[in-house]
C-alpha cells in the first residue's frame, strides 16, 4: 500500500512539476526590468526565452519575437535547449509511468516489468527536473552578470548634462517557476525510484515445486528463490532479478543439504 | 464620438478645496487612462495627475500630497480633488485621455478655469 | 524630473518656409525595449486646447496634414513644419512620456514673418 502511494504521489508531484516546466518555459517573464534607483517609469520592459515585451502603463502590451536563431546569444539557445530537453524527457516520463503506476493494470503486465518502467521514469524526472534547475540557473547567473556590468556603467553622461540610463534586468517570475516546478520534478523521480524498490512480487516460498524421479531423493526447486537458513542478517527470502520469467524446465536445480524433503 | 467636458472651476479662497470633473463620453474609463494637465494665465502646459484604466494613479511631485485624481467608472466621470489651495494653482484645467499606445494624449476638454484669490 | 528644453522661444518664420522646433530631454526617452521613442508634440492655439500632432517622436496622429514632421531619438528631437501655412501660427510644445511626471517643454511660440 505504502509502495503503491509512494508511486502515485511521485507521479502527481513530476506532473504538476512538468507542468511548471512547460509553463516556466512559456513564461515571458524571465528577466524583468529592474525599477530600484531608477526614475518612474511608464514603460516596463521584460523578456522571456522566445519573445521580449514592453507594457505601458495605459495597459498596452506589445511583445516581439527573437525571429532570428543566430543572432542569439549562445547562452540563450542553451538555456532554451536544456528547457526542451527537460519537457521531452519528462513527458516521456510521465508516459512511461502511467504504465508503470501500480493501479492501473495492462494485460498480464509482470510487477518486476512495472518496477523497472517506474524506476525509468523516476530517472527520467529526476534528470529532467536537473535540465529544468540548470537551465533556470543559467540564465539567473547570466542576469547577475549582465546586471553588475550595466551597473558599472549605468550612467554615461554627455557633458554632464544628459544622462542616458542603461536598462538593467532583474529576476523574472518565470525563474522562481523554473527552480520550483524542477525542484518538484526531482522530488517526483526520487519518490518514484524509491517506490521501485517495493515494486517487484511478493510471493510465497515454495510456490513452484517440481518433483523429479532422481533416484533416492525428491528435489524441489524454488522458483525464482534462493533458499535461505534462517540465521544471520539475511532473515527472508531475496527475490532474483534474472531479466525474465522462466519455465520450471529451464532453471536447473543443484542438490544441496536444503534441496531434500 | 470622443468627448471631455470639464467643470467645478471657480474662484476659491487659499487654503480651500475644490473638486473639479470631467464627464468623458464616447469610451469608457475602463479601457483608457486620463490626465489632468493645467495651464496657468500666458504660461506654459504643466502635467498634473493620471489615472489608469486599472485604476493607478501618478502624479507631479509638487502636487502630490494635495491634488487627488479619481474616477468613478459607472458614471463616466474623473475627478482632482484639489487641498490647501495656492494662489499658484490659478490655472485653466484640462482633462485629456490617453490614446493608449505610446502613451500620447489625444483628446482634450476645453479647460476649466480656477482662481484662487483672497 | 525630467526637464525638456525647446528652442528657440519664438520663431518668425515666413509663409511656405520650414519652421524647425528643437527640443532636449535631460534624459534619454528611448525604450530599449521597443526601440521606441516616448516624446509627443503638442499645438496650441489661442484659445483654444492643445492639440496632439506627433506620439513615439515621429507618428503622425491621424487628421494631422503632413507637413509636420517629427524626427530624432533618445535626447534630441525636432519637430518641422515644412511649409508653414497661416493656419500654424500657435505654440508648440514637447512632452515626455516615458518617465513620471510627464512633463512638457516650456513652448515654442511660432510666428508669421
Known amino acids: 500500500m505504502a509502495v503503491t502511494a509512494c508511486q502515485g504521489l511521485g507521479f502527481v508531484v513530476s506532473l504538476i512539476g512538468i507542468a511548471g516546466i512547460i509553463a516556466a518555459t512559456c513564461m515571458d517573464q524571465w528577466s524583468t526590468q529592474d525599477l530600484y534607483n531608477n526614475p518612474v517609469t511608464a514603460v516596463f520592459n521584460y523578456q522571456g526565452l522566445w519573445r521580449s515585451c514592453v507594457r505601458e502603463s495605459s495597459g498596452f502590451t506589445e511583445c516581439r519575437g527573437y525571429f532570428t536563431l543566430l543572432g542569439l546569444p549562445a547562452m540563450l539557445q542553451a538555456v532554451r535547449a536544456l528547457m526542451i530537453v527537460g519537457i521531452v524527457l519528462g513527458a516521456i516520463g510521465l508516459l512511461v509511468s502511467i504504465f508503470a503506476l501500480k493501479c492501473i493494470r495492462i494485460g498480464s503486465m509482470e510487477d518486476s516489468a512495472k518496477a523497472n518502467m517506474t524506476l525509468t521514469s523516476g530517472i527520467m524526472f529526476i534528470v529532467s527536473g536537473l535540465c529544468a534547475i540548470a537551465g533556470v540557473s543559467v540564465f539567473a547567473n547570466m542576469l547577475v552578470t549582465n546586471f553588475w556590468m550595466s551597473t558599472a556603467n549605468m550612467y554615461t553622461g554627455m557633458g554632464g548634462m544628459v544622462q542616458t540610463v542603461q536598462t538593467r534586468y532583474t529576476f523574472g517570475a518565470a525563474l522562481f517557476v523554473g527552480w520550483v516546478a524542477g525542484g518538484l520534478t526531482l522530488i517526483g523521480g526520487v519518490m518514484m525510484c524509491i517506490a521501485c524498490r517495493g515494486l517487484a512480487p511478493e510471493e510465497t516460498n515454495y510456490k513452484a515445486v517440481s518433483y523429479h524421479a532422481s533416484g533416492h531423493s525428491v528435489a524441489y526447486k524454488p522458483g525464482g528463490f534462493k533458499a535461505s537458513t534462517g540465521f544471520g542478517s539475511n532473515t527472508k527470502n531475496k527475490k532474483i532479478y534474472d531479466g525474465g520469467a522462466r519455465t520450471e524446465d529451464e532453471v536447473q536445480s543443484y542438490p544441496s543439504k536444503h534441496d531434500y524433503v | 464620438q470622443v468627448q471631455l467636458v470639464e467643470s467645478g472651476g471657480g474662484v476659491v479662497q487659499p487654503g480651500r478645496s475644490l473638486r473639479l470633473s470631467c464627464a468623458a463620453s464616447g469610451f469608457t474609463l475602463t479601457s483608457y487612462g486620463v490626465y489632468w494637465v493645467r495651464q496657468a494665465p500666458g504660461k506654459g502646459l504643466e502635467w498634473v495627475a493620471v489615472?489608469?484604466?486599472?485604476?493607478?494613479?501618478n502624479y507631479a511631485d509638487a502636487l502630490k500630497g494635495r491634488f487627488t485624481i479619481s474616477k468613478d467608472n459607472s458614471k463616466s466621470t474623473l475627478y482632482l480633488q484639489m487641498n490647501s489651495l495656492r494662489a499658484e494653482d490659478t490655472a485653466v484645467y484640462y482633462c485629456?485621455?490617453?490614446?493608449?499606445?505610446?502613451?500620447?494624449?489625444?483628446?482634450w476638454g476645453q479647460g476649466t478655469l480656477v482662481t484662487v484669490s483672497s | 524630473d525630467i526637464v525638456m528644453t525647446q528652442s528657440p522661444d519664438s520663431l518668425a518664420v515666413s509663409l511656405g518656409e520650414r519652421a524647425t522646433i528643437n527640443c532636449k530631454s535631460s534624459?534619454?526617452?528611448?525604450?530599449?525595449?521597443?526601440?521606441?521613442?516616448?516624446l509627443a508634440w503638442y499645438q496650441q492655439k489661442p484659445g483654444q486646447p492643445p492639440k496632439l500632432l506627433i506620439y513615439?517622436?515621429?507618428t503622425r496622429e491621424s487628421g494631422v496634414p503632413d507637413r509636420f514632421t517629427g524626427s530624432g531619438s533618445g535626447t534630441d528631437f525636432t519637430l518641422t513644419i515644412s511649409s508653414l501655412q497661416a493656419e500654424d501660427v500657435a505654440v508648440y510644445y514637447c512632452?515626455?512620456?516615458?518617465?513620471?511626471?510627464?512633463?512638457f517643454g516650456q513652448g515654442t511660440k511660432v510666428e508669421i514673418k
Open positions: 534624459q534619454s526617452l528611448l525604450n530599449s525595449g521597443n526601440q521606441k521613442n516616448y
Open positions: 485629456a485621455r490617453d490614446r493608449g499606445r505610446l502613451l500620447a494624449m489625444d483628446y
Open positions: 512632452q515626455n512620456d516615458h518617465f513620471f511626471p510627464f512633463t
Open positions: 489615472v489608469w484604466a486599472g485604476g493607478n494613479t
Open positions: 513615439g517622436a515621429s
